[in-house]
């Protein structure tokens, strides 16, 4: 829905960002005062039937009391109370609960598996290109180029651990210095936050849910971007990360440890390895300028190989080329040396779907990309549905209170730090910040976790992923130990520095405000979410990459004016909101600019025109397609998946009919029912007690 279209320009309430606000947010008024529980559901249903409730063009009349869109929805119980059930009902309800729990765990399992396969798909599609980004010699001298390469590579391979391990191997083989590697690590940190942003896009069907989910996901992006914005110049000027980590590495005499425990992989690997298995060494080899690797496939064919190390005699141009002076001889004509040759004999093929297809990497990657996104989307919808039906009444109250309530005064400030530890711990357990933040996204969307609470959890996740890297570094072989440990520590201290910048003082929690702002814009103009993703994770990095290749002069020539304009706009914006009297009347608002430069409305019209062709044929054959369809064409009835969208004329006829936003309905079941997602009959017999 678009209940508050004007919020795109609204300033968030600064009072909301005081320490402890997370738990003390004003809750939404009891909706029963506005509607008589489930009795009058018919009226809203009929109205929604008439209306293109998902059209960004539709302006919906709101109830007079406009609530804060960031308030968590009240998930009220519409089912029969436990005490009122007979024994049969209680048993049935118990088994229903167990069934839901099993389903939830099952969908969660496939959700995590699809994230893993999504990463593999991205590596197949863009892995080789990612490897080639690393072989650019300018990285050494240009930190900005290093940063964007880190972003692009991580986005392309959908795994910060892959890009970090490439950096580590390049540093250990002296192809890269630690100094040059730091910006790449910073970029990898940014790149890894795209995953949960993609996951948030899957919740596009419900405007208020999408607002929260997208803001919850992008809070990670903004934290990383802002941290880099401040810390990259600081690092370039002082090299503090390099110096601190070098001191730590040199002061400890580390012994090689054991591998970081693969906790979640143990469960997901048996399934994911049946889908596809990759030879990730290929990307590293390409990064290290190995010409042979460019023609190798990333799809692993042979899983069991016998490696036989033999020594062979080879001729060398001169004795200087000998392996060692003692392994050098002549036959009187040529100089010979002994070379260790590893002869690999293939024994058994891998057991995965693509092993015998011999398809190009791009084809396999594209197939997996589509399938994994469909599974990801389907699982997410089902998780949200199951959670929606489970998290009602008492269960919801308990969970929400537990997660979002602060410690009692004077220890309220400690709650966030505990959340950081929880985030770090959970990420350490699942061994992936992407998995943890992606699992968090739907919970933010459905209103179980506030953005204020999700923020420290996300920051903790950033820390958790670096502790995993530190453990992995301690397990690396002797020659790579120092470099991998130093890089892992750089990653760790970068995130710690970021937290110190953007968390301790509530006023500095800019990522929350920025994410909420973006959430509001994206809820109103949903195409903007995709636009944001493309701009921030592809276009900006690619532009900087291109300009960097052209040379420092070009980069500075283009970059300085752009940065100057951005600073100017920000300063003007700040003055407009804080002390407009200082400014001339003309500059006190943005009205002096043409509409297309200060509003997304004209752009929305362009996007609507562009997607018009999709709208006409917006056939929603299944919920999964439907969500993707909603995102692209903002189809009026795309989430009524029983039939194809009706003509746009009909949709436009009912555009001025005032409609009660689903947020004002008694519970999720009703609001979803109103959207044609849940059959009306089901809501009455809903079993909510677990």
């Amino acid at each position: 829905m678009a209940p508050w279209p004007e919020l795109g320009d609204a300033q968030p309430n600064p009072d909301k960002y005081l320490e402890g606000a997370a738990g003390q947010q004003p809750t939404a008024p009891d909706k029963s005062k506005e509607t008589n529980k489930t009795d009058n559901t018919e009226a809203p249903v009929t109205k929604i039937e008439l209306l293109p409730s998902y059209s960004t063009a539709t302006l919906i009349d709101e109830p007079t009391e406009v609530d804060d869109p960031w308030n968590l929805p009240t998930l009220q119980d519409s089912g029969i109370k436990w005490s009122e059930r007979d024994t049969k009902g209680k048993i049935l309800c118990f088994f229903q609960g167990i069934g839901r729990l099993i389903l939830l765990l099952g969908f969660l399992y496939f959700f995590v598996c699809s994230l893993d396969i999504l990463s593999s798909a991205f590596q197949l599609v863009g892995g080789k290109m990612a490897g080639q980004f690393f072989s650019n010699s300018s990285i050494m001298s240009n930190p900005l180029l290093g940063l964007v390469i880190g972003v692009l590579v991580t986005v392309l391979v959908q795994s910060s651990s892959t890009s970090t391990s490439i950096v580590v191997s390049m540093v250990s083989s002296s192809l890269l210095t630690v100094r040059a590697a730091i910006p790449i690590i910073m970029g990898a940190n940014i790149g890894t936050s795209i995953t949960n942003t993609i996951v948030a896009l899957m919740q596009v069907g419900d405007r208020s849910e999408f607002r929260r989910a997208f803001a919850g996901a992008t809070v990670h992006d903004f934290f990383n971007w802002l941290s880099v914005l401040v810390l990259l110049p600081v690092e370039v000027a002082t090299h503090y990360l390099e110096i601190i980590t070098q001191l730590i590495v040199e002061s400890f005499h580390f012994k090689n440890g054991e591998d970081a425990p693969d906790l979640l992989k143990v469960i997901t690997k048996p399934f994911t390895k049946l889908i596809v298995q990759l030879d990730k060494k290929v990307i590293s080899q390409i990064a290290m300028n190995d010409e042979k690797a460019k023609n190798k496939s990333l799809v692993k064919i042979w899983c069991k190989t016998f490696t036989n190390k033999t020594q062979i005699n080879v001729t060398v141009p001169s004795t200087a080329n000998c392996t060692s002076p003692s392994l050098c001889w002549t036959d009187g004509i040529q100089n010979w040396t002994m070379k260790n040759v590893t002869y690999k004999e293939n024994i058994a093929k891998c057991q995965h779907i693509f092993v015998n297809f011999h398809l190009p990497d791009l084809a396999v990657g594209t197939i997996l990309l589509i399938l994994s996104l469909l599974v990801l989307c389907g699982c997410l919808i089902m998780i949200v549905k199951i959670l929606g039906s489970v998290l009602k009444g008492q269960v919801a109250t308990v969970i929400k209170k537990t997660i979002n309530t602060d410690f009692p005064f004077p220890f309220a400030w400690l709650t966030g730090y505990l959340a950081i530890l929880v985030g770090a711990g959970m990420t350490f357990i699942v061994q992936s910040s992407s998995v943890f933040t992606s699992a968090l996204t739907p919970l933010i969307g459905i209103g179980v976790i506030t953005i204020e609470r999700a923020y420290p959890l996300t920051l903790g996740s950033n820390i958790g992923t670096t502790t995993t890297a530190i453990l992995a570094a301690l397990a690396s072989p002797g020659n790579a130990l120092r470099s991998s440990l130093q890089i892992a520590l750089c990653h760790f201290f970068f995130n710690i520095s970021g937290i110190l910048l953007w968390y301790p003082i509530p006023f500095t929690r800019l990522p929350i405000r920025m994410a909420k702002g973006l959430g509001n814009i994206s809820a109103k103009y949903r195409w903007f979410a995709v636009f944001y993703l493309i701009i921030f994770f592809f276009l900006i990095p690619l532009t900087v990459f291109g300009l960097s290749l052209a040379g420092w002069r070009v980069l500075v020539g283009v970059g300085v004016p752009v940065v100057f304009i951005i600073i100017l706009v920000l300063c003007l914006r700040l003055l407009q909101s804080r002390c407009p009297r200082v400014l001339p009347k003309k500059l006190q608002n943005w009205n002096f600019l043409p509409l297309w430069m200060r509003s997304l409305k004209p752009w929305d019209a362009v996007v609507s025109k562009f997607t018009g062709c999709f709208q006409m044929r917006c056939c929603c054959c299944c919920r999964v397609c439907c969500r993707a369809c909603c995102l692209l064409c903002d189809c009026p009835k795309c989430c009524r998946c029983s039939k194809c969208c009706e003509d746009l004329e009909e949709a436009q006829e009912g555009q001025d009919v005032p409609v009660k936003a689903p947020e004002t309905f008694d519970n999720i079941t009703i609001s979803r029912e109103a959207q044609g997602e849940v059959p009306a009959s089901d809501s009455k017999t809903e079993c909510t007690a677990l």
Epitope: N313, T319, P325, S326, L327, C328, W329, T330, D331, G332, I333, N335, W336
Partner: antibody, heavy 120, light 107 residues
């Protein structure tokens, strides 16, 4: 079996040249390197150089560079060693030898030797 | 060039005795060393290559050892037919060089 038969003894004046031949049999001629080693009367062995008959590649001891030329005639399976600008100290028995131990400079088959005497 | 210094230059011993001839290279030659036997009026004959590998048909009383710069040829039990001059040779670098030789005689 492998046989290396060298040409007969030669008596040369200082400043002249000598061409010693070594006819091979019992193996594939182009397979092995052919070495030339000399031994002055009552002295040790001294390596002159080697030729790979398959390609004609040669390698000479720096001491003899510019004075020695080794050639191979694949049609007759014969190797020639020519030493020019002879001096009295070039008086020695000249041996041709091959190394059938691939990639090594250890020579396992030797010719009977050709005595070259340089005297005015 | 790599110099190969052989010692002793000559030795006289009895049949059945153990004979040890040493060879010292002026620089590291790894194990690229061969030993030759030359009887009076004959061409040299290869005994050992790669420091310790006996050539075909060489009796097992002949053995070689060493690496780097120091090498040894051992005749475990001297026989009358072993009377000859023994040469060491390095084939680690061009030019190939030989030791000065060790003349072995029977008392």
């Amino acid at each position: 079996q492998v046989q290396l038969v060298q040409s007969g003894a030669e008596v040369k004046k200082p400043g002249a040249s000598v061409k010693v031949s070594c006819k091979t049999s019992g193996y594939t001629f182009i397979t092995y390197n052919m070495h030339w080693v000399r031994q002055a009367p009552g002295q040790g062995l001294e390596w002159i150089g080697a030729i790979y008959p398959g390609s004609g590649d040669t390698s000479y001891n720096q001491k003899f560079k510019g004075r020695v030329t080794m050639t191979a005639d694949t049609s007759t399976s014969t190797v020639y060693m020519e030493l020019s600008s002879l001096r009295s100290e070039d008086t020695a028995v000249y041996y041709c030898s091959i190394s059938t131990i691939i990639t090594t400079g250890a020579v396992d088959y030797w010719g009977q030797g050709t005595l070259v005497t340089v005297s005015s | 060039d790599i110099q190969m210094t052989q010692s002793p230059s000559s030795l006289s011993t009895s049949v059945g005795d153990r004979v040890t001839i040493t060879c010292k290279a002026s620089q590291d030659v790894g194990t690229a060393v061969a030993w030759y036997q030359q009887k009076p009026g004959q061409s040299p004959k290869l005994l050992i290559y790669w420091t310790s590998t006996r050539h075909t048909g060489v009796p097992d009383r002949f053995s070689g050892s060493g690496s780097g710069t120091d090498f040894t040829l051992i005749i475990r039990s001297l026989q009358p037919e072993d009377v000859a001059t023994y040469f060491c040779q390095q084939y680690s670098r061009i030019p190939l060089t030989f030791g000065g030789g060790t003349k072995v005689e029977i008392k």
